[in-house]
């Protein structure tokens, strides 16, 4: 016997209070698949988050981060402060890369310069806080 709720499309829920008819999701909620018995609360992009895509009756809102921050985690679950190139984020804020390390992005950690001698090469261009060394023949 087919479940009558399976006929309820995305954007609705199967309403047990109304003999299992398909009722529209309330405002600020959605159902992305058919046959749901409740709708889901829309994600709200507040504070450091900003709305990249509005919630609709069939899909959740999508957030990104305000300028000066970048997304971390699945679906941008967190926003992390940007640093400048040549820096990394620590518990005490943005700190310059130590000598011998670099970071060419606004996120992530400082990484050691390439050791050219491991490949039998020499340093063609010295490294900086923002750039790795360039190895030559």
């Amino acid at each position: 016997l087919q479940d009558p709720c399976s006929n309820c499309p995305a954007g609705t829920f199967c309403d047990n209070n109304r003999n299992q008819i398909c009722s529209p999701c309330p405002p600020n909620s959605f159902s992305s698949a058919g046959g749901q018995r409740t709708c889901d609360i829309c994600r709200q992009c507040k504070g450091v988050f900003r709305t990249r895509k509005e919630c609709s009756s069939t899909s959740n809102a999508e957030c990104d981060c305000t300028p000066g921050f970048h997304c971390l985690g699945a679906g941008c679950s967190m926003c992390e402060q940007d640093c400048k190139q040549g820096q990394e984020l620590t518990k005490k804020g943005c700190k310059d890369c130590c000598f011998g390390t670099f970071n060419d992005q606004k996120r992530g950690i400082c990484r050691p310069w390439t050791n050219c001698s491991l490949d039998g090469k020499s340093v063609l261009v010295n490294g900086t806080k923002e750039r790795d060394v360039v190895c030559g023949p």
Partner: nanobody, 122 residues
């Protein structure tokens, strides 16, 4: 027990106005997310308007924006829908609704009343 009693419907000419009322009991209108849904002849339910986030924001369907205004009287525990510039396509049974948030994170709504019929016709 939650009860919702709608009133204020009737027959009105296109361009006219009506004010629907919903007297609530069994819960406090000012502390909940509440609104109006409607069902036009031969069609499914449609959300019209709602007061959300304990009054922090309001929702209006695109089809009624600028014409309908939702409000509430906390002292009377009553929800209102002021409808103006009415059109034939606004003809429907209007139900007061209480949005229900379930422990598992789901959202549904309750309509306990019989609704009030609004007919827009010349």
């Amino acid at each position: 027990e939650v009860q919702l009693l709608e009133s204020g419907g009737g027959l009105v000419q296109p361009g006219g106005s009506l004010r629907l009322s919903c007297a609530a009991s069994g819960f406090t209108v000012s502390a909940e997310d509440v609104g109006w849904v409607r069902q036009a002849p031969g069609k499914g339910l449609e959300w019209v308007s709602a007061i959300l986030d304990s009054g922090g924001s309001t929702y209006y369907a695109e089809s009624v924006k600028g014409r309908f205004t939702i409000s509430r009287d906390n002292a009377k525990n009553t929800l209102y829908l002021q409808m103006s510039s009415l059109r034939a396509e606004d003809t429907a049974v209007y139900y007061c609704a209480r949005i229900v948030y379930h422990a598992g994170g789901g959202v549904t709504f309750d309509t306990r009343g019989q609704g009030t019929q609004v007919t827009v016709s010349s």
